[in-house]
């Protein structure tokens, strides 16, 4: 390893970042993610923790940029330097910026996030096989409806796993159409209009009108951007692969190498390019954001370029799946800053007497393994018709079951999940909820279908939890996490994406903990997590038993109601208060009873 | 040791070309920035160009669409083409090497310079 | 472009003494400068870059400071190999920009 002459470093241990613009590559979220998760490479091996802020004051500043970007070391256009770091320091020294003429990617081909399906909204995979021709873009083969969809594996024929692509035919975006999507054609200033158009701005957005005639409904969306077939070079960069095109008279739906001695990937731009010559190159692999990010925060910290092949610091961009970092990182980086301190020697904890009544003997929790059947909203897959549009979540139109005795939630035994959302508290259980508000007689209303509000989640939940800034829904499903904003769902993601290792099976609740802040159970332990960066802190890790004495050791979901913690234990409750910074158990009750106030017959 | 040899100055009549070629040892050629300076008889420094190690070029307002800079990393060379030229072309070219390479960034400075080529334009 | 102005344009000091030598940018470039010296008949030499690390081989009596739009060169006892012109040059922002020379001379 080297690091920069005089041993240039932070001399604050607690840096912080800020993340001042995005990169149209990826969804804002996998950037988010992207970066967090490479601070929390180094993170991990030294006393440094990055907090994400939102103003320019922070010690490293990202930014994505574009030839001259304001600095005195302009981009390079594709590929050669990908990116930059200056060592640490005031003002510009420490910040980090990415050129925005290379794909972004996790290293792996575009990232596209797909909707309904039956993948749970994973991200396509590219190339994949359907009908035994191989795709690197989404495609509409095999549907009569238009809409574009891709496998989320390899191969659709073997394993059936499949999404739609973004596309206006589904949603729009912002504008003010609440997201619905297109109506083709639509009328716009007396023109007919049957594809998104720029018309009318001047900022490049495509958008379309979102009812037959705009000019009398005013009613728009911005139409969502397609990375996967967003061409580059050629004669048309920035426009939209138009599958199937025709080229020397044969038809393609897909990207083709044909004509070409090079074997890269292009398509048309326009249906037809014998007559149009309008083409350019498909997107390639891209470069890992994650990758290149924790290589320039290596330099942002102090790091020159190490002389080791297999480094992470080395200078060469190598993809790997691996983890990053080698031995020569992790020294380099501690003669900076020095080890991870160890946690803190314990004392011996004293068992702290359990409350007598109801009795403590429960289950060992909810199972790991969660059926696999999974409730798709719109087809069952390609082929076919599929959803006109996508369904709308909301009160509205969730479905009310037909009541069985078990539908009532005075039958349940034991919740999957419980989390107050709004002012409502809901109540989750093999795949469906109840919603119910405090008040004299009341009772929980419901069952509703979970796959009605938020068709992305699996029918069998450990955990939810609303943070209530930017209402945003956690959703947690053994080592997966959706994030519901609205309609739009982020996820499936895995644990490990919120800095929780591969030893945590579950989360099995959340309280809130200051502005912004969480914190995440699983079994006996807990950890601080940071909604905004959507990661954990790895050292708040600790002891539930410390924190909050007297609450039985393996609760099977822990939840937040009316400004108290609950800790669920078989069909029980411990109800925790704070007083003056001690947490004590101030209740135990039965959780159908004393909450939901059933009846006792 | 680092060296670096220009060559092909001389005395060219305005709106003739010249082209200027560097050839450099002693480092890892292709992983470097290269760039010409060059300074008037009398005057100070001002930088023309610079080539990245991916080919990406840059050039000064005064000579952009003029000159070509470019490199030949099996040769270890740098060239400027210098076409249309102008009086106020008559300068000592001097082909220079970052001190740093790379992505990570601090002002390091040229710290290898050649021994310059005399271009006078001139009728 | 960022403004580099050098002062003073000459500077007469004697063998032995202090010299000075200042570069204002016309607006903040952080620490990205570095200083060079040039004999006549002779390509530059970098001397100081990132506004105070001295270049390999540089003598110690030279040193660099400042950061922002303030920077000087300080040659702590001057030595009669030392008068020559001096450059500085920033990369705060692009494109590069020198100054445009403080000439040392012998008193």
């Known amino acids: 390893f080297q690091t920069f002459e005089g041993d240039l470093k932070w001399h604050h241990h607690n840096i912080t970042y800020w993340i001042q613009n995005y990169s149209e590559d990826l969804p804002r979220a996998v950037i988010d993610d992207a970066f967090a998760r490479a601070f929390a490479l180094w993170s991990a091996v030294t006393p440094l923790t990055f907090t994400r802020v939102y103003s320019r004051d922070a010690d490293i500043v990202i930014q994505f940029g574009v030839a001259e970007h304001g600095d005195g070391y302009p981009f390079d256009g594709k590929d050669g330097l990908l990116a930059h770091a200056f060592p640490p320091g005031p003002g510009i020294q420490g910040d980090a910026h990415f050129d925005d003429d290379e794909l972004w990617s996790l290293g792996k081909g575009v990232v596209v996030p797909t909707r309904f399906g039956n993948a749970d909204g994973a991200a396509c995979h590219f190339p994949f096989i359907f009908e035994g021709r191989s795709y690197s873009a989404c495609t509409t083969d095999g549907r009569s409806d238009g809409l574009p969809w891709c496998s989320t594996t390899a191969n659709y024929d073997t394993d059936d796993r499949f999404g739609f692509c973004p596309s206006e035919r589904l949603y729009t975006q912002d504008g003010n159409a609440d997201g619905k999507p297109c109506q083709f054609p639509f009328i716009f200033q007396g023109q007919s209009y049957s594809a998104c158009t720029t018309d009318g701005r001047s900022d490049g957005y495509r958008w379309c009108a979102t009812t037959a005639n705009y000019d009398r409904d005013k009613l728009f969306g911005f139409c969502p951007t397609r990375a996967d077939s967003t061409v580059m070079g050629g004669n048309s960069a920035g426009e939209l692969c138009v599958f199937p095109f025709t080229f020397l008279g044969k038809e393609y739906s897909t990207c083709t190498s044909e004509g070409r001695g090079d074997g890269r990937l292009w398509c048309a731009t326009t249906s037809n390019f014998d007559s149009d010559k309008k083409w350019g190159f498909c997107p390639d692999q891209g470069y890992s954001l994650f990758l290149v990010a924790a290589h320039e925060f290596g330099h942002a910290l102090g790091l020159d370029h190490s002389s080791v092949p297999e480094a992470l610091m080395y200078p060469m961009y190598r993809f790997t799946e691996g983890p990053p970092l080698h031995k020569d990182d992790v020294n380099g980086i501690r003669h900076l800053y020095g080890p991870r301190p160890e946690p803190e020697p314990r004392p011996p904890t004293t068992t702290t007497p359990q409350p007598t009544a109801p009795p403590t003997v429960c289950p060992t929790g909810p199972p790991t393994v969660h059926p696999s059947e999974r409730p798709t909203a719109g087809p069952t897959g390609p082929p076919s018709a599929g959803p006109t549009g996508p369904p709308t979540a909301g009160p509205s139109t969730a479905t009310t079951v037909p009541l069985s005795p078990v539908d009532d939630a005075c039958n349940v035994n034991i919740f999957d999940a419980i989390a107050e959302i709004g002012n409502q508290l809901y109540l989750f259980k093999d795949g469906k909820y109840w919603r119910f508000s405090e008040g004299r007689g009341s009772r929980p209303q419901g069952p509703f279908l979970i796959a009605d509000k938020w068709p992305a989640l699996p029918r069998k939940l450990d955990s939810v939890f609303e943070e209530r800034l930017s209402k945003k829904l956690f959703f947690f499903s053994g080592r997966q996490v959706w994030v519901y904003t609205g309609a739009s769902v982020l996820g499936p993601r895995r644990l490990d994406k919120l800095g929780l290792g591969a030893d945590v099976a579950q989360v099995t609740g959340a309280l809130r903990s200051g502005r912004g802040k969480m914190l995440l159970f699983s079994g006996r332990r807990l950890w601080r997590f940071d909604v905004k960066a959507q990661m954990v802190d790895p050292r708040s890790a600790s002891e539930v038993d410390r924190m909050f004495p007297g609450v039985p050791l393996d609760t099977h979901d822990v939840f937040q109601y009316r400004e108290k913690a609950y800790f669920c234990q078989d069909r029980f409750y411990w109800r925790v208060s704070s007083r003056s910074e001690l947490n004590q158990v101030d209740q135990v009750g039965y959780v159908t009873y004393d909450i939901l106030q059933c009846p006792e017959d | 040791e680092v060296q670096l040899l220009e060559s092909g100055g001389g005395l060219v009549q305005p709106g003739g070309s010249l082209r200027l070629s560097c050839a450099a040892s002693?480092?890892?050629?292709?992983?470097?920035d290269m760039w010409w300076v060059r300074q008037a008889p009398g005057k100070g420094l001002e930088w023309v160009s610079v080539i990245y190690p991916s080919g990406t070029t840059f050039y000064a307002d005064s000579v952009k669409g003029r000159f070509t800079i470019s490199r030949d990393n099996s040769k270890n060379t740098l060239y400027l083409q210098m076409n249309s030229l102008r009086a106020e072309d008559t300068a000592v070219y001097y082909c220079?090497?970052?001190?740093?390479?790379?992505?990570?960034?601090?002002?390091?400075?040229?710290?290898?310079w050649g021994q310059g080529t005399l271009v006078t334009v001139s009728s | 472009d960022i403004q580099m102005t050098q002062s003073p344009a000459t500077l007469s000091l004697s063998p032995g003494e202090r010299a000075t030598l200042s570069c204002r940018a016309s607006?903040?470039?952080?620490?990205?400068l570095a200083w060079y010296q040039q004999k006549p008949g002779q390509a530059p030499r970098l001397l100081i870059y990132d506004a105070s690390y001295r270049a390999t081989g540089i003598p110690a009596r030279f040193s660099g400071s400042g950061s922002g739009t303030d920077f000087t060169l300080t040659i702590s006892s001057l030595e009669p190999e030392d008068y020559a012109v001096y450059y500085c040059q920033q990369r705060g922002n692009w494109p590069i920009t020198f100054g445009q020379g403080t000439r040392l001379e012998i008193k």
């Open positions: 002693g480092f890892t050629f292709s992983q470097y």
């Open positions: 607006q903040s470039i952080s620490s990205f």
């Open positions: 220079a090497k970052d001190r740093a390479y790379g992505d990570y960034v601090g002002w390091n400075g040229f710290d290898y």
